[in-house]
């Protein structure tokens, strides 16, 4: 016996109570594939979530976060607080980056400034809470009377720190 349910398109469900007739999904539900025996309940974007795309009979609603928060996880399953540049989010809220670290985004953690000396360079522009340091030429290149043909510092193998 042929399964009539396989003929039911997206946006409908196969109603066993009505001799496997394809019935439209009820309000606030959807089926994104054919041959479904039930429709799924639409996601509700409420509270800290706002609707980015309304639910239709064939696709779920898509949520975003209210201004001041950003999406986390697949399909914006969570909303997480934004911070200012120069801060990171902790359980106590947004906190300024400690000296020697920076964050140039509204999310994520404070990361240490680049250590220019590890690459044989000098600090050209100091770091701030919002910006990493800018490394410049090596100190030898900047010393008076230094030859412009100074050979480059030997390259380090990746994953090896200087002795």
């Amino acid at each position: 016996l042929q399964d009539l349910c396989s003929n039911c398109p997206a946006g409908t469900f196969c109603d066993n109570n009505r001799s496997q007739i394809c019935s439209p999904c009820p309000p606030n539900s959807f089926s994104s594939a054919g041959g479904q025996r039930t429709c799924d309940i639409c996601r509700q974007c409420k509270g800290v979530f706002k609707t980015r795309k309304e639910c239709s009979s064939t696709s779920n609603a898509e949520c975003d976060c209210i201004s001041g928060y950003h999406c986390l996880g697949a399909e914006c399953s969570m909303c997480e607080q934004d911070c200012k540049q120069g801060q990171e989010l902790t359980k106590k809220g947004c906190k300024d980056c400690c000296f020697g670290t920076f964050n140039d985004q509204k999310r994520g953690i404070c990361r240490p400034w680049t250590n220019c000396s590890l690459d044989g360079k000098s600090v050209l522009v100091n770091g701030t809470k919002e910006r990493d340091v800018v490394c410049g030429p090596s100190p030898a290149d900047l010393s008076p009377g230094a030859s412009s043909a100074t050979p480059p510092a030997p390259a380090r193998e990746p994953g090896h720190s200087p002795q």
Partner: nanobody, 123 residues
Framework: EVQLVESGGGLVQPGGSLRLSCAAS?????NYWMNWVRQAPGKGLEW???????????YYVDSVKGRFTISRDNAKNSLYLQMNSLRAEDTAVYYC????????????????SGQGTTVTVSS
């Protein structure tokens, strides 16, 4: 169905007090960090306070420290926000929100919240 329902908002004069409540259903409250967040008219969402699973850790945004107290009663599946010395700038829709799995470890994301309760502070 996982649900949070806030209540207790209203109109109050500056210097007055209100106690907001949040009733949780469809999940075990004692397994989750819980938060209060608010949205003032025309502004973005602002985190207000949070509390860990057993109530031993509580944190507040600077602007409400010493005036607001977050608490919970896991036996009653309820979260509270006692608001004292209210100011005009506390006028907002207040939402109760659950910290998602891994809150405080991997992230500080909120995965469920209610529809909100409106607090208006005006003379």
């Amino acid at each position: 169905e996982v649900q949070l329902v806030e209540s207790g908002g209203g109109l109050v004069q500056p210097g007055g007090s209100l106690r907001l409540s949040c009733a949780a259903s469809g999940f075990t409250l004692s397994n989750y960090w819980m938060n209060w967040v608010r949205q003032a008219p025309g502004k973005g969402l602002e985190w207000v306070a949070n509390i860990n699973q057993d109530g031993s850790e509580r944190y507040y945004v600077d602007s409400v420290k010493g005036r607001f107290t977050i608490s919970r009663d896991n036996a009653k599946n309820s979260l509270y926000l006692q608001m004292n010395s209210l100011r005009a700038e506390d006028t907002a829709v207040y939402y109760c929100a659950r910290g998602g799995e891994g809150y405080g470890v991997d992230h500080y994301g909120l995965d469920v919240s209610g529809q909100g309760t409106t607090v208006t502070v005006s003379s």
